[in-house]
Amino acid sequence: QQAPYWTHPQRMEKKLHAVPAGNTVKFRCPAAGNPTPTIRWLKDGQAFHGENRIGGIRLRHQHWSLVMESVVPSDRGTYTCLVENAVGSIRYNYLLDVLERSPHRPILQAGLPANTTAVVGSDVELLCKVYSDAQPHIQWLKHIVINGSSFGADGFPYVQVLKTADINSSEVEVLYLRNVSAEDAGEYTCLAGNSIGLSYQSAWLTVLPEEDPTWTAAAPEARYTD
């Protein structure tokens, strides 16, 4: 027999969850023990079943999770998972703060991505930092030329999607370009979107031919310019 213990404590490190109103919140307390423990949830010290909550809650015992959709300010509080079996019990507190700011289009940090100059064969990183109340998704685009033109008949640029990702708010998103060639030169755009809209910022990558070995030693591998 064994008292309950956390199986993935690293997934429980984020104690404070500050989320915009309208978002979905998920708390998890994955545990094990012998006999298999049960889990119940408290809100501010009281048994919590979500009866008084618009939209209710989802309890997924096999995932040791509590899910609340479309959180509102009245959902703020301390949420405790209480895991117990015949041998013992453990508990963990999560703090939920619901932010009421007006959700806005993603804001991209000025100057990112930055114009960059690199040498053929080198590696390049383009950075994009996104601030967004609603969870943002991101795309990296490369502007391309088709039949000698950068723009279609409708006046919009031709682009190729290089990468698509969902990210957490305020994360830095990186586009890695390995072993660049002359064909990699051009305009790159970081596009961030959320439920309100899209925001774009672009940068140019200049790729120089391999440098003459007689002066390579004095030159940096990649130069970054604004």
Partner: antibody, heavy 124, light 112 residues
């Protein structure tokens, strides 16, 4: 052809509930945020709610918060608005509007496609 | 919330003559990406609103070039270079930078 078709409007008494639906066709519904906008008779336009492409984010106008719930079923290309505790001032034509896409867009990033609207009348 | 104020309320026009509608926002609609997120719509009698202009000055596909949008971060103008009979209806400006999305009160354009 890109199209949004609302349904579910009607006459209802104050305090009662109504559920509006919007059927989308001609585009990848699951890649777009969706909005509801309403227009009271003879009045201007008022934004009501938005839901993200995957349903994880929802935002509401203060005038409907706590009473209305926006939802979507991407498998059926359907947007819904559950309206509870209806008030006389909720009387309006309700429009379903396509929002921002999940990626690069040629032209405006949303609010370009509107349905024809469905009329909701709250009256005793 | 961002307040959008439109003027005039009503605009009687003569076909072939120019017309101009103003819209002011209570906060700048110039975003960090350099775009200004104001839209203009026309709602013809008995119809849904239709986009004319997006992102301050871009004409929506199929919109005649007699329509143009201009302005700064808080002051916007929709111009019709030569009004036609089919242009009658109510014109709305809208901010699309943050929720709640807000509309101007509308300008009713009618033929004199």
């Amino acid at each position: 052809e890109v199209q949004l078709l609302e349904s579910g409007g009607g006459v209802v008494q104050p305090g009662r509930s109504l559920r509006l639906s919007c059927a989308a066709s001609g585009f990848t519904f699951s890649s777009y945020a969706m909005h509801w906008v309403r227009q009271a008779p003879g009045k201007g336009l008022e934004w009501v709610a938005v839901i993200s492409y995957d349903g994880s984010n929802k935002y509401y106008a203060d005038s409907v918060k706590g009473r209305f719930t926006i939802s979507r079923d991407n498998s059926k290309n359907t947007l819904s608005l559950q309206m509870n505790s209806l008030r006389v001032e909720d009387t309006a034509i309700y429009y379903c509007v396509r929002g921002a896409g999940r990626g690069y867009t040629y032209g405006p990033d949303g609010f370009d496609i509107w349905g024809q609207g469905t009329m909701v009348t709250v009256s005793s | 919330d961002i307040v959008m104020t439109q003027s005039p309320l009503s605009l009687p026009v003569t076909p072939g003559e120019p017309a101009s509608i103003s819209c002011t926002s209570s906060r700048s609609l110039l975003h960090s990406d350099g775009k200004t997120y104001v839209y203009w719509y026309l709602q013809k009698p008995g119809q849904s609103p239709q986009v004319l202009i997006y992102e301050l000055s871009n004409r929506f596909s199929g919109v005649p070039d007699r329509f143009s949008g201009s302005g700064s971060g808080t002051d916007f103008t929709l111009k019709i270079s030569r009004v036609e009979a089919e242009d009658v209806g109510v014109y709305y400006c809208m901010q699309y930078i943050e929720a709640p999305l807000t509309f101007g009160g509308g300008t009713k354009v009618e033929i004199k």
